[in-house]
């Protein structure tokens, strides 16, 4: 199944003009992500049954090794190159995490809503980073990193994955907020 | 219908490698499914060895207590997989079954009919 | 490390009995229970997947219940072509586990 994300990999051929007051744009995006983060992670590790709700240290920790760093401090340029990779990493693992929650949880229908609420808002923000890279900083490329191919996993790790991606999505995205 | 067919030598000198492999019939290789080893010594209960998903991540998953010595590969042109088992013992002589699971690969829905590897010298 | 514990390794019964197989995950497994027969010199034949799915073709006189760490197979009246080998099989996590299935359960005739 495609992944809710598919990266502009261009030179900066901008096809429509960029919205107005385009930071306050990527402002309230990512303050509406912050504001939902925690319940899709009480969503997510809820819907997974034990041994999970008992164990979130253990299981759920942020411990996601190749995640894209995210230096608060750099430049506004700095920061959206950082943003857009934390973007499309957390595009492509949300994806992941949706079809196997298709197939392990189909019953969970609040969770693929929440989980495909927020993919859509992660899209708004990805076009957005791109629009400002483009159009202020002349920057149509970013390398980019994607998050880990779940698809071969057994049950427990799929799930776990999950969590810890989740777990780091609820902590890096309220470090984003604050630092735009 | 889907068929899995085992072969392989039938008999393996004690240190040496056995090298087993399945031939998946009526089935698209490329499909999102898992392929495991499972042997059976004589008498004994299934146990586990390994499996290999084909896709793009090729993850596999061995039985620790044999992890040091299996290897699971595929091909996916010729829709085989096969597994090799080092520096084997008589412990390793058993009935070694081909299987398949379908998406999230929690059971074993294909099975081959089984091959008998005696270990001796 | 989930360990798979089969309960009895065999029992007797007759034709007609209703027969109860048990089997306990070391830790929580989920509902990714499966169950299987085993006639000699023969593959084995997935009955029951998940807990309590019937798999395609097999006689509603099998059944599975059960969740977490303890499941439960069930043949309510035991025919002459039930007599095998039954074992459980856990499908929740193959990382560091030895063996995903139970030691199995013999049914032979009384």
């Known amino acids: 199944s495609p992944l809710p994300i598919t990266p502009v990999n261009a030179t900066c051929a901008i096809r429509h003009p960029c919205h107005n007051n385009l930071m306050n744009q990527i402002r309230s995006q990512l303050a509406q992500l912050n504001g939902s983060a925690n319940a899709l992670f009480i969503l997510y590790y809820t819907a997974q049954g034990e041994p999970f709700p008992n164990n979130l240290d253990k299981l759920c920790g942020p411990n996601v090794t190749d995640f894209p760093p995210f230096h608060a401090n750099g430049t506004e340029k700095a920061k959206l190159v950082e943003l857009y990779r934390i973007v499309v990493y957390l595009g492509t693992s949300l994806g992941n995490i949706t079809r196997d929650q298709k197939i392990l949880n189909p019953s969970a229908l609040s969770l693929h809503s929440k989980l495909n609420a927020t993919a859509d808002i992660l899209r708004g923000l990805l076009s957005n980073v791109l629009c400002r890279l483009c159009s202020k900083y002349h920057v149509g490329h970013v390398d980019v990193t994607y998050g880990p191919d779940t698809s071969g996993k057994d049950v427990f790790q799929k799930k776990k994955l999950g969590c810890q991606l989740l777990g780091k999505y609820k902590q890096i995205i309220a470090v984003l907020a604050q630092a735009f | 219908q889907v068929q899995l067919q085992e072969s392989g030598p039938g008999l393996v000198k004690p240190s040496d490698t056995l090298s087993l492999t399945c031939t998946v019939s009526?089935?698209?290789?490329?499909?999102?499914?898992?392929w495991s080893w499972i042997r059976q010594p004589p008498g004994k209960g299934l146990e586990w060895i390994g499996y290999i998903y084909v896709g793009t991540s090729g993850d596999t998953y061995y039985n620790p207590s044999l992890k040091s010595r299996v290897t699971i590969s595929v091909d996916t042109s010729k829709n085989q997989f096969s597994l090799k088992l080092s520096s084997v013992t008589a412990a390793d002589t058993a009935v070694y079954y081909c299987?398949?699971?379908?998406?999230?690969?929690?059971?074993?829905?294909?099975w081959g009919q089984g091959t008998l590897v005696t270990v001796s010298s | 490390d989930i360990q798979m514990t089969q309960s009895p390794s065999s029992l007797s019964a007759s034709v007609g009995d209703r027969v109860t197989i048990t089997c306990r995950a070391s830790?929580?497994?989920?509902?990714?229970l499966n169950w299987y027969q085993q006639k000699p010199g023969k593959a084995p034949k997935l009955l029951i997947y998940r807990a309590s799915s019937l798999q395609s073709g097999v006689p509603s006189r099998f059944s599975g219940s059960g969740s977490g760490t303890d499941f439960t197979l069930t043949i309510s009246s035991l025919q002459p072509e039930d007599f095998a080998t039954y074992y459980c099989q856990q499908g929740y996590s193959y990382s560091d586990t030895d063996n995903v299935f139970g030691g199995g359960t013999k049914v032979e005739i009384k």
């Open positions: 009526g089935f698209s290789f490329s499909t999102d499914y898992w």
């Open positions: 830790e929580t497994i989920s509902g990714y």
């Open positions: 299987a398949g699971a379908d998406n999230p690969y929690d059971y074993f829905n294909l």
